[in-house]
Interface confidence: medium
């Protein structure tokens, strides 16, 4: 058993049929010694008396808010949550496996630049009685500070018969050094509590590996005289690290016909303009990637050819 | 070329070669990016590598003030990786394919380090400890880890030279 926060405790249980469970001793936080009784949740049934209560925690029915009273007055509470371990593996019932970039990916994180700011998100099908708490650091044995905000519900989607909820959190490294080569990974830890079930999820990454620039901005076409060619120009996204002479991007320019089956013409360039042939009903798209490190491409910025 | 006493390197040549190094490092093992090579305990064990750290003067301001600190750190790293790529980790079994970019990568690391340090001037360089893996599978894993680390190192070096070529060239 360990303390998650004040008056909230997590009991770690091996979860199998007829498991013996864990013996837990609760102590009433009071100077009083006599006349103390214990109840669980809203029930008025007295579970025991005395300053301490010893219980055998085996299942969710044994978890909940234990309250000690004296003469009708509440003295203190202890909320017991369960963390299940099945076949040596902690349960992951609360969050959905996003399966990208690999199986057992519950948390996904992205950064728009090298400033030390990043966003993580996760999915669940649970809509109520759900709380999240997020902590982060750079390195784990000698952790350096990363500050995370509160997790918020950022999207709701319908997937078949189910509703899916996306939560996200923003974090910022306290003393980020954008130009340095990272040697210790960022660690992100999410505590999830659904009713009386506790689970924790972790992710470990370098900012450089989760970089995904915003799409290029101000995408414009300029027809070239007496030619089917156009000059496409764009700018670095506002959110990208500066100076651009140091934090450089490379770009992919794509000409795509109306039909997805039509052949795509692609040009790669380090410049912020390119000359391409504009076909009727086609569109021109540009996306960006860090020039020197192959992290994710941005989403496409697009304009129609006409 | 970087000359003792602090005159400028051939920023544009260094830029071109460092950008080529980035391309080669990723083509040497493109899938490495999608492998999680940091097993438990690794945070503790991968740190004795010449990382370009915050105080090394490789940021735009540091380069403007005095690029020599940064260039020396980059040189140290280039020699470090050049020696690793020339060691039995890459020359031993399982053999690399004949068209593997590792050979080119090795030569380019050497080429860039020589651009930074002409004959007759010696920055002290790292004695690389012999990793001498005993099993072919250990060698394979080490190759992945070394290339992954090299990708991060040369990305920073390439940014330094690109910025230098754009803003510090005579």
């Amino acid at each position: 058993i360990w303390e998650l926060k004040k008056d909230v405790y997590v009991v770690e249980l091996d979860w199998y049929p007829d498991a013996p469970g864990e013996m837990v001793v609760l102590t009433c936080d009071t100077p009083e010694e006599d006349g103390i009784t214990w109840t669980l949740d809203q029930s008025s049934e007295v579970l025991g008396s005395g300053k301490t209560l010893t219980i055998q925690v085996k299942e969710f029915g044994d978890a909940g808010q234990y309250t000690c009273h004296k003469g009708g007055e509440v003295l203190s509470h202890s909320l017991l949550l369960l963390h299940k371990k099945e076949d040596g593996i902690w349960s992951t019932d609360i969050l959905k496996d996003q399966k990208e970039p690999k199986n057992k990916t519950f948390l996904r994180c992205e950064a728009k630049n090298y400033s030390g700011r990043f966003t993580c998100w996760w999915l669940t099908t649970i809509s109520t009685d759900l709380t999240f708490s997020v902590k982060s650091s750079r390195g784990s044995s000698d952790p350096q500070g990363v500050t995370c905000g509160a997790a918020t519900l950022s999207a709701e989607r319908v997937r078949g018969d189910n509703k899916e909820y996306e939560y996200s959190v923003e974090c910022q490294e306290d003393s980020a050094c954008p130009a340095a080569e990272e040697s210790l990974p960022i660690e992100v830890m999410v505590d999830a509590v659904h009713k009386l079930k506790y689970e924790n999820y972790t992710s470990s990454f370098f900012i450089r590996d989760i970089i995904k620039p915003d799409p290029p901005k101000n995408l414009q076409l300029k027809p070239l005289k007496n030619s089917r060619q156009v000059e496409v120009s764009w700018e670095y996204p506002d959110t990208w690290s500066t100076p651009h002479s140091y934090f450089s991007l490379t770009f992919c320019v794509q000409v795509q016909g109306k039909s997805k089956r039509e052949k795509k013409d692609r040009v790669f360039t380090d410049k912020t303009s390119a000359t391409v042939i504009c076909r009727k009903n086609a569109s021109i798209s540009v996306r960006a990637q860090d020039r020197y490190y192959s992290s994710s491409w941005s989403e496409w910025a697009s304009v129609p050819c006409s | 070329r970087a000359v003792p006493g602090g005159s400028s390197p051939a920023w544009t040549q260094c830029q071109q070669l460092s950008q080529k190094l980035c391309t080669l490092a990723w083509s040497a093992h493109p899938l490495v990016g999608h492998m999680d090579l940091r097993e438990e305990g690794d945070e503790e064990t991968t740190n004795d590598v010449p990382h370009i750290q915050c105080g090394d003067g490789c940021d735009p301001q540091g380069l403007r003030d005095n690029s020599q600190f940064c260039l020396q750190r980059i040189h140290q790293g280039l020699i470090f990786y050049e020696k690793l790529l020339g060691s039995d980790i890459f020359t031993g079994e399982p053999s690399l394919l004949p068209d593997s970019p590792v050979g080119q990568l090795h030569a380019s690391l050497l080429g860039l380090s020589q651009l930074l340090q002409p004959e007759g001037h010696h920055w002290e360089t790292q004695q690389i400890p012999s990793l001498s893996p005993s099993q072919p599978w250990q060698r394979l894993l080490l190759r992945f880890k070394i290339l992954r680390s090299l990708q991060a190192f040369v990305a920073v070096a390439a940014r330094v030279f690109a910025h230098g070529a754009a803003t510090l060239s005579p």
Epitope: D142 | E40, G41, E44, T45, N47, Q53, P133, L141
Partner: antibody, heavy 122, light 110 residues
Framework: EVQLLESGGGLVQPGGSLRLSCAAS????????MMWVRQAPGKGLEWVSS????????MYADSVKGRFTISRDNSKNTLYLQMNSLRAEDTAVYYC???????????????WGQGTLVTVSS | QSELTQPASVSGSPGQSITISCSGT?????????VSWYQERPGKVPKLIIY???NRPSGISSRFSGSKSGNTASLTISGLQAEDEADYFC??????????FGTGTKVTVL
């Protein structure tokens, strides 16, 4: 040739302080993690402390935590161990040793100094 | 854990093989493959003879070999020779980034 030379040992009273130095040569000192290991008379070896190449991270044995401080000066190729609040049980030969860790391969103590004797006694 | 457990002494006749065990926990020996062995001859400084469980530094005789099973590492000296008489210490990196030594084993060549 790799060489490590400790100095600064001697007789000190309980509660006293001592600063050990280790001068390194024959290798690029700034690239290796360095450690102090001690051996009490007639006893086994005990790891005391280690410091990463940049000096950015230090680790200590529980027996010395809060009393000893490891540091390094890469420009002088020198490792230090500041020992405060010394106790009789700190009496030992203190060795400076070079270690490293690369890509999931950890090696400790491939080269050792000759050691310097610290005696804590009243 | 403050020390890894080794037998206090092991002896053997010249030409024989002996094995020294080094018992730890899942936080040190069992946690990874960063186990090394040192030979300490009287009046000499410790000498690294095995690292990463089973690797020998250059110059170390192939008569020395290492292995590991679970939380226990072993050092085997085959073809025992008079010059092998010394104290032997195992050492393990721990998952918290520290190091721990064994209690030491005195090897006597009969």
């Amino acid at each position: 040739e790799v060489q490590l030379l400790e100095s600064g040992g001697g007789l000190v009273q309980p509660g006293g302080s001592l600063r050990l130095s280790c001068a390194a040569s024959g290798f690029t000192f700034s690239m290796y993690r360095m450690m102090w290991v001690r051996q009490a008379p007639g006893k086994g070896l005990e790891w005391v402390s280690s410091i990463r190449p940049s000096g950015g991270m230090t680790m200590y044995a529980d027996s010395v935590k809060g009393r000893f401080t490891i540091s390094r000066d890469n420009s002088k190729n020198t490792l230090y161990l500041q020992m405060n609040s010394l106790r009789a049980e700190d009496t030992a030969v203190y060795y400076c040793t070079r270690g490293w860790a690369l890509f999931g391969v950890v090696r400790m103590g491939d080269y050792w100094g000759q050691g310097t004797l610290v005696t804590v006694s009243s | 854990q403050s020390e890894l457990t080794q037998p206090a002494s092991v002896s053997g006749s010249p030409g024989q093989s002996i094995t020294i065990s080094c018992s730890g926990t899942s936080s040190d020996v069992g946690g990874h493959n960063f186990v090394s062995w040192y030979q300490e001859r009287p009046g000499k400084v410790p000498k690294l003879i095995i690292y990463d469980v089973n690797n020998r530094p250059s110059g170390i005789s192939s008569r020395f070999s290492g292995s590991k099973s679970g939380n226990t590492a072993s050092l085997t000296i085959s073809g025992l020779q008079a010059e092998d008489e010394a104290d032997y210490f195992c050492n393990s990196y721990t998952i918290t980034g520290t190091y721990v030594f064994g209690t030491g084993t005195k090897v006597t060549v009969l």
